[in-house]
């Protein structure tokens, strides 16, 4: 399992370490989640051939996974700090239902799946403190999320495996784009 933020495995323990700044905490938190996703992807890819499948489009039709686009202001061209931060927080809030779906989808990495979910909640809190315009952030409707979760859990085994793979891949892409954008803020 990844080392919790603040004891990041990518840091050599330094004596008298300075307390982490807000930016550093966010960066570490995202790296921590990405490490967790890598571990979950390993189990998914080992368990099925989803990672090599060319039938992703079939399953993608059932999903509305958040994606970064140029209009979101997170790319270097047309970068807009406020618009981008709203997109990142909104996207993470939208991913929460999919992270809930991932719970119980893993055998040997059950704790890892929980860690990714909980760490994402903490990341959202960090980012909300950073955001000036919280009114612009739309929170997903709980009823809609509940019915989406029911629908995803009712899929056949193949679609459930494919959905798991797509969620992990999309979440990884979203976090990587977020990481780069946040480094410009």
């Amino acid at each position: 399992a990844p080392v919790p933020p603040g004891e990041d495995s990518k840091d050599v323990a330094a004596p008298h370490r300075q307390p982490l700044t807000s930016s550093e905490r966010i960066d570490k938190q995202i790296r921590y989640i990405l490490d967790g996703i890598s571990a979950l992807r390993k189990e998914t890819c080992n368990k099925s051939n989803m990672c090599e499948s060319s039938k992703e489009a079939l399953a993608e039709n059932n999903l509305n996974l958040p994606k970064m686009a140029e209009k979101d202001g997170c790319f270097q061209s047309g970068f807009n700090e406020e618009t981008c931060l709203v997109k990142i927080i909104t996207g993470l809030l939208e991913f929460e239902v999919y992270l809930e779906y991932l719970q119980n989808r893993f055998e040997s990495s059950e704790e890892q799946a929980r860690a990714v979910q909980m760490s994402t909640k903490v990341l959202i809190q960090f980012l909300q403190k950073k955001a000036k315009n919280l009114d612009a952030i739309t929170t997903p409707d709980p009823t809609t999320n509940a019915s989406l979760l029911t629908k995803l859990q009712a899929q056949n085994q193949w679609l459930q495996d494919m959905t798991t793979h797509l969620i992990l891949r999309s979440f990884k892409e979203f976090l990587q784009s977020s990481l780069r954008a946040l480094r410009q803020m």
């Epitope: 050599v12 990884k172 892409e173 976090l175 990587q176």
Partner: antibody
Framework: QVTLRESGPALVRPTQTLTLTCTFS??????????VGWIRQPPGEALEWLAH???????YYNPALKGRLAVSKDTSKNQVVLSMNTVGPGDTATYYC????????????WGQGILVTVSS | DIQMTQSPSSLSASVGDRVTITCRAS??????LAWYQQKPGKAPKLLIY???YLADGVPSRFSGSGSGTDYTFTISSLQPEDIATYYC????????FGQGTKVEIK
């Protein structure tokens, strides 16, 4: 096995546009987190980062050269193209392409480089 | 934009010596730093990424440390094949290289 190879003209006239192609194998620019960057090194001088392009078409440029550079990708051909307009003698250098993977963002594989001379 | 100041620009040491190179960023780069080795006429080679991680196949005599703005690259016991120029590079935003450190044998 990952390989990258730079190709383009060895000699360019001042004021012209330099176009370099990086052809790679062993990885795909469709893979999330993957990026290809361009770096140059004038003779006897230090490395200078120019630009890089990510799998999702996000592009980053050296601010000092931003107006003169354009980077694009053709994932079907496994190629990344760098264009630099209005070149001058100061652009004489060995140009390298390199790949970065994932959020550790270090250039783990490099091409062998191509020496480009700008002269009339 | 973040500037990288690498020192010294050159150094001369004996085989077996401990060699240290430093890189200072103009602001916090949160351990997003790589170190490269470049031999004459060759492309650079990645040695260290994320400030402390050894790249695949790199001998353990090379190491990296640091956090915040200050980073150090160390060769614990200099070997003849380590004669090269070493560069740091950060990855916080747009990534410049340090000016390089040329390592020679006394």
């Amino acid at each position: 096995q990952v390989t990258l190879r730079e190709s383009g003209p060895a000699l360019v006239r001042p004021t012209q546009t330099l176009t370099l192609t990086c052809t790679f194998s062993g990885f795909s620019l469709n893979t999330s987190g993957m990026t290809v960057g361009w770096i140059r090194q004038p003779p006897g001088e230090a490395l200078e980062w120019l630009a890089h392009i990510w799998w999702n078409d996000d592009k980053y440029y050296n601010p000092a050269l931003k107006g003169r550079l354009a980077v694009s990708k053709d994932t079907s051909k496994n190629q990344v193209v760098l264009s630099m307009n209005t070149v001058g003698p100061g652009d004489t250098a060995t140009y390298y392409c390199a790949r970065m993977e994932d959020y550790d963002e270090a250039m783990d594989y490099w091409g062998q480089g191509i020496l480009v001379t700008v002269s009339s | 934009d973040i500037q990288m100041t690498q020192s010294p620009s050159s150094l001369s040491a004996s085989v077996g010596d401990r060699v240290t190179i430093t890189c200072r960023a103009s602001e916090n780069i949160y351990s997003n730093l790589a170190w490269y080795q470049q031999k004459p006429g060759k492309a650079p080679k990645l040695l260290i990424y994320a400030a402390t991680y050894l790249a695949d196949g790199v001998p353990s005599r090379f190491s990296g440390s640091g956090s915040g703005t200050d980073y150090t690259f160390t060769i614990s016991s200099l070997q003849p094949e380590d004669i090269a120029t070493y560069y740091c590079q950060h990855f916080w935003g747009t990534p410049p290289f340090g000016q390089g450190t040329k390592v020679e044998i006394k």
